[in-house]
């Protein structure tokens, strides 16, 4: 899988879209996970509704939401009140049993808010990820500010 880069601004919302073949993945729940290491686990952040027919309903875990357009074949993840530590390598997944197929690899880049004059040195910055081929950049920056919640903490 190639990796798609989505750029967001700290404090704002970022929408990530993962297109897929709706027929091939018919009846499958979807998930959004964070790659914790090069060969390490991809930790589940949030998944779609337990009932596939209700996948269109937005589900939240902390500041991350997921919704699935099962007919159109587009999984949408929203990261609200984006923080520097939200940066990283993620995967959109299609679930079947205990297995998961990767729909898309996503690199989230978090840029400092140009209108925020706080000292950038007080922010935290994230990192990078395994070698990706020809990453495509999508400037997917939403200006609508939502009330922030505590970012999802990784656990092993």
């Amino acid at each position: 899988h190639n990796t798609t880069v989505f750029q967001g601004v700290a404090g704002q919302s970022l929408q990530v879209s993962c297109p897929y073949d709706s027929m091939k993945h018919w009846g499958r729940r979807k998930a959004w996970c964070r790659q914790l290491g090069e060969k390490g686990p991809c930790q589940r952040v949030v998944s779609t509704h337990n009932l596939w027919l209700l996948s269109f309903l937005r589900r939240w875990n902390g500041s991350t939401a997921i919704t699935d357009d099962t007919l159109g074949g587009t999984l949408t993840i929203t990261l609200r009140n984006l923080q520097p530590h939200d940066a990283g390598l993620y995967q959109c997944q299609s679930l079947h049993g205990s297995e998961a197929d990767t729909l898309r690899k996503v690199l989230v880049e978090v840029l400092a808010d140009p209108l925020d004059h706080r000292d950038a040195g007080d922010l935290w910055f994230p990192g990078e990820s395994e070698s990706f081929e020809d990453a495509h950049v999508e400037h997917s920056i939403s200006r609508s500010l939502l009330e922030g919640e505590i970012p999802f903490p990784p656990t092993s």
């Epitope: 530590h85 840029l111 922010l123 935290w124 994230p126 990078e128 950049v137 990784p154």
Partner: antibody
Framework: EVQLLESGGGLVQPGGSLRLSCAAS????????MAWVRQAPGKGLEWVSS????????YYADSVKGRFTISRDNSKNTLYLQMNSLRAEDTAVYYC????????????WGQGTLVTVSS | DIQMTQSPSSLSASVGDRVTITCKAS??????LAWYQQKPGKAPKLLIY???NRFTGVPSRFSGSGSGTDFTLTISSLQPEDFATYYC?????????FGQGTKLEIK
């Protein structure tokens, strides 16, 4: 194989300037945040500066803010650290590091380049 | 800022020994901890990330555990190449701070 090769270190007088470079290979450089970490002689590790994969945002430790500038040239797979107004306490081995996805740990390190600030 | 304190500062052990190095955070850091190994004149190498995940190529004799404020790095059976200095590091949230290091020497 991931490789990071620093250069540009040396002896400089207090108040002087130096520019460090780090040539990266073995991975898609433009997809990674990068950072500089330093180690004073006989001391522990100290994070110095980082920047995002596009170079769109930069971050600095308080100890170097306003004096050091981190940058990158993704077309050349190279990371830089411009160091101005150098002080004796900046004397250290400077390591170029690659950072793993949003987690703040450094998975690959260069061999380091020594910067000595002395009159 | 959260401080990371390692103990002991130095440790003498023999090949084959089981060794434990501890790292204490001044506040709860969850499982957001990494460990590095550094040999004299060399760059540090990542050993463990997120408390317990071994990095690529790291031997299984190295293991990490803990959560909250107390963490340990264990070497189950010391090998000659393991004599080095070990650093813990708080990760994921700012600021990135390292412990002062634990020097593991041959007895």
């Amino acid at each position: 194989e991931v490789q990071l090769l620093e250069s540009g270190g040396g002896l400089v007088q207090p108040g002087g300037s130096l520019r460090l470079s780090c040539a990266a290979s073995g991975f898609t450089f433009s997809n990674y945040y990068m950072a500089w970490v330093r180690q004073a002689p006989g001391k522990g590790l100290e994070w110095v500066s980082s920047l995002t994969n596009s170079g769109g945002s930069t971050y600095y430790a308080d100890s170097v803010k306003g004096r050091f500038t981190i940058s990158r040239d993704n077309s050349k797979n190279t990371l830089y650290l411009q160091m101005n107004s150098l002080r004796a306490e900046d004397t250290a081995v400077y390591y170029c590091t690659r950072e793993w996805a949003g987690s703040g740990y450094f998975d690959y390190w260069g061999q380091g380049t020594l910067v000595t600030v002395s009159s | 800022d959260i401080q990371m304190t390692q103990s002991p500062s130095s440790l003498s052990a023999s090949v084959g020994d089981r060794v434990t190095i501890t790292c204490k955070a001044s506040q709860n850091v969850g499982n957001n901890l990494a460990w590095y190994q550094q040999k004299p004149g060399k760059a540090p190498k990542l050993l463990i990330y997120y408390t317990s995940n071994r990095f690529t190529g790291v031997p299984s004799r190295f293991s990490g555990s803990g959560s909250g404020t107390d963490f340990t790095l264990t070497i189950s059976s010391l090998q000659p190449e393991d004599f080095a200095t070990y650093y813990c590091q708080r990760i994921y949230n700012s600021p990135w701070t390292f412990g002062q290091g634990t020097k593991l020497e041959i007895k």
